[in-house]
Amino acid sequence: DGCNDIFMKNEMLSASQPFAFNCTFPPITSGEVSVTWYKNSSKIPVSKIIQSRIHQDETWILFLPMEWGDSGVYQCVIKGRDSCHRIHVNLTVFEKQWCDTSVKGLPNLSDEYKQILHLGKDDSLTCHLHFPKSCILGPIKWYKDCNEITGERFTVLETRLLVSNVSAEDRGNYACQVILTHSGKQYEVLNGITVSITERAGYGGSVPKIIYPKNNSIEVQLGTTLIVDCNITDTKDNTNLRCWRVNNTLVDDYYNESKRIREGVETHASFREYNLYTVNITFLEVKMEDYGLPFMCHAGVSAAYIMLQLPAPDFR
């Protein structure tokens, strides 16, 4: 059929909860392409009707929710003007038993469900939630050994659980839970994460580099919306936390009530020698009180600020 088979991806998934997979393969999917999903070499594409339990949503395949019979190999076909590529995704559905103490281990979970905390350091766990824009995600709750996590050593920040001064007792089975809303219906997402510990520094104690901001000022009109990216390069194995703070407080906590200023979701691009991280700060509406205040981007021991200033008056 003239299509190039790119690769096979294996995913272990939990029954009875939503799952989505995005058909992206840069640079192939960055141009003008059409994406079509199929199951088990069927000639009939996956439905695009949003009421269907399994349907294609733009480049995504979305299961609302996943069921036992959904195991199998799915193909996403990427067609360009002069090209055709096919990605195979092998989905295996298992029954989740996060809280069943008789089950000693979880199945062979994918790497994002196995995470490592570094003893004696401030570290974080990430709740990996990969869903299309049509899915609205509620606040995340975190559990350890099936008990909701509380205590001042733990802070929930976007999709991350910050853990300060990691101890040996922090190892074990975690879960992050979120309510997903799609077309007015609600579904529970519960991701189990096995968390191990290490004393190894891993990243060789290197210092992350903040590319931007550079302790600079930004001219911005009162009342406008502003988004500023913090761009950071760091070693691949780093355990550094990246966040925005004001007055030495996480912006999400400082503006907890008004939510006028928020930290965005961290993204990263992987290069051969390092990762490039981006985490933004959004000012929904710039107010007078924001001017002259240093908004600090932190990455491990590194920090840099931006300061808002009113534009110079135009006397023309």
Partner: antibody
Framework: QVQLQESGPGLVKPSQTLSLTCTVS??????GYWNWIRNHPGKGLEYI?????????YYNPSLKSRVTISRDTSKNQFSLKLSSVTAADTAVYYC??????????????WGQGTLVTVSS | DIQMTQSPSSLSASVGDRVTITCRAS?????MYWYQQKPGKAPKLWIY???NLASGVPSRFSGSGSGTSYTLTISSLQPEDFATYYC?????????FGQGTKLEIK
């Protein structure tokens, strides 16, 4: 059950490069830390280095100028290369990994070891 | 580098004896790991995080210590315990082993 198996030549000539491969089954090398350790005859254990889940490598400074640890995720293997060997590099070489009771540094799983003799 | 010094280097003891092996670090370490090795075999994880026994390790073994001084104790020596024991730290690189303590039958 995690299993590790070392393979490579048992005899290497002085000044040449020692090359060993560790094949892993029952776990993915894209999780955890994958270590090389050696045991000199009649002497103790010496930590050589590791390659981590992300491909980051750490080498013992005493060997750093001569050692390279790499991996092939498609084959679930990781490898050790030690250049410019001398008789002092004659040892039993082990690959090992941790993760026991969620402790990455607890090296619970070991290969059976392979004796490498450096001799002309 | 953190130097790990085990004492004694070798020890002759009888079945039923209580035996203590000490590992001293040249700087503070957070946790100690102990391995048992028998001739011609790979080392086995014996004690981790200073005091936790690995799977299959008899309860007559115990580990303790903090800072720079750590011990492995066998309350009543059995024939299968005769082996070489190594301590190891992962607190500071390079990750060093002790020189080993060879436990022999008297």
């Amino acid at each position: 059950q995690v299993q590790l198996q070392e393979s490579g030549p048992g005899l290497v000539k002085p000044s040449q490069t020692l090359s060993l491969t560790c094949t892993v089954s029952g776990a993915s090398i894209t999780s955890g830390y994958w270590n090389w350790i050696r045991n000199h005859p009649g002497k103790g254990l010496e930590y050589i280095g590791y390659i981590s889940y992300s491909g980051y490598t750490y080498y013992n400074p005493s060997l750093k100028s001569r050692v390279t640890i790499s991996r092939d995720t498609s084959k679930n293997q990781f490898s050790l290369k030690l250049s410019s060997v001398t008789a002092a590099d004659t040892a039993v070489y082990y690959c090992a990994t941790g993760g026991y009771d969620y402790v990455e540094d607890a090296l619970y799983y070991w290969g059976q070891g392979t004796l490498v003799t450096v001799s002309s | 580098d953190i130097q790990m010094t085990q004492s004694p280097s070798s020890l002759s003891a009888s079945v039923g004896d209580r035996v203590t092996i000490t590992c001293r670090a040249s700087s503070n370490v957070r946790y100690m790991y102990w391995y048992q090795q028998k001739p011609g075999k790979a080392p086995k994880l014996w004690i981790y995080l200073t005091s936790n026994l690995a799977s299959g390790v008899p309860s007559r073994f115990s580990g303790s210590g903090s800072g720079t001084s750590y011990t492995l104790t066998i309350s009543s020596l059995q024939p299968e315990d005769f082996a070489t024991y190594y301590c190891q730290q992962f607190t500071t690189s390079p990750y060093t082993f002790g020189q080993g303590t060879k436990l022999e039958i008297k």
